[in-house]
Interface confidence: medium
């Protein structure tokens, strides 16, 4: 056991938040400020991420962690751990490289991120148009044509598409 | 390390003109889009224009077409924005950022970005 313990590499006993320092015989010496190591037995620290710019510091960075960012107000992270920072757009528009565009007719987008996409096609599912589409939102389709004839059972319209304070006809 | 560097900021008078440079590090700035943003005081960022990598592609935000060029020298690693007829609502931190397209169809995200550049406009 002792002579297996001699041949470990000395730099395996360093933890996380210092570095094995072959300048100075191998001893664990902590991590310089501005730079972190999340694993033992590494013989560097890495530098820690900078928030700057667009993106702001979520978490500090830590001699054991790095430091995380986010993108402030008026964009949102893509990537992996926000490596990047994306405009948001209004509701009813999409991001193009001439900037925010509204949604062209027969589009919409709900959201402030992401592409405006087509109106839901009722006819398809042999459904009707209750509820009109606009920039953004979809259309909401409504029971078929047939079902809507005179003798048909009358079919009560989903709830989302009633508006406040009128009752279905 | 990956590095922007901007500078050419400063005081002018309503009607007049700057040239704001970025110095480009660190990566093969030829191969991105680069992206001029700016920040007014108390606002949001507001993208300004965008170029794409041979400068053969340009977009301006409305308020400034016409007035402000954007340009590149892939050869010096230098994103410039030539501002002309400057108003009083220029007034603003500059900011220059690497990206703008080309992270797929709908990705318009931007990676790294300097820090900035004041421009008053100010008679």
């Known amino acids: 056991f002792e002579r297996t313990r001699s041949l470990q590499d000395p730099c395996s006993n360093c933890p996380a938040g210092t570095f094995c320092d072959n300048n100075r015989n191998q001893i664990c010496s902590p991590c310089p400020p501005n730079s972190f190591s999340s694993a033992g037995g590494q013989r560097t620290c890495d530098i820690c991420r900078q928030c700057k710019g667009v993106f702001r510091t979520r978490k500090e960075c830590s001699s054991t962690s790095n430091a995380e960012c986010d993108c402030t107000p008026g964009f949102h992270c893509l990537g992996a751990g926000c490596s990047m920072c994306e405009q948001d757009c209004k509701q009813g528009q999409e991001l193009t490289k001439k900037g925010c565009k509204d949604c062209c007719f027969g589009t919409f987008n709900d959201q402030k991120r992401g592409i405006c996409r087509p109106w839901t096609n009722c006819s398809l599912d042999g459904k009707s148009v209750l509820v009109n589409g606009t920039k953004e939102r979809d259309v909401v389709c409504g029971p078929s044509p047939a079902d809507l004839s005179p003798g048909a059972s009358s079919v009560t319209p989903p709830a989302p598409a009633r508006e406040p304070g009128h009752s279905p006809q | 390390e990956v590095q922007l560097v901007e500078s050419g900021g400063g005081l002018v008078q309503p009607g007049g003109s700057l040239r704001l440079s970025c110095a480009a590090s660190?990566?093969?700035?030829?191969?991105?889009?680069m992206t001029w943003f700016r920040q007014a005081p108390g606002r949001g960022l507001e993208w300004v224009a965008n170029?794409?990598?041979?400068?053969?592609?340009?977009y301006y935000v409305d308020s400034v077409e016409g007035r402000f060029t954007v340009s590149r020298d892939n050869a010096k690693n230098s994103l410039y924005l030539q501002m002309n007829s400057l108003r009083a609502e220029d007034t603003a931190v500059y900011y220059c950022?690497?990206?703008?397209?080309?992270?797929?169809?709908?990705?318009?995200?931007?990676?790294?970005w300097g820090q900035g550049t004041t421009v008053t406009v100010s008679s």
């Open positions: 660190g990566f093969t700035f030829s191969s991105y889009w």
């Open positions: 950022a690497r990206g703008g397209l080309g992270y797929g169809d709908s990705h318009y995200g931007m990676d790294v």
């Open positions: 170029i794409n990598q041979d400068g053969s592609e340009k």
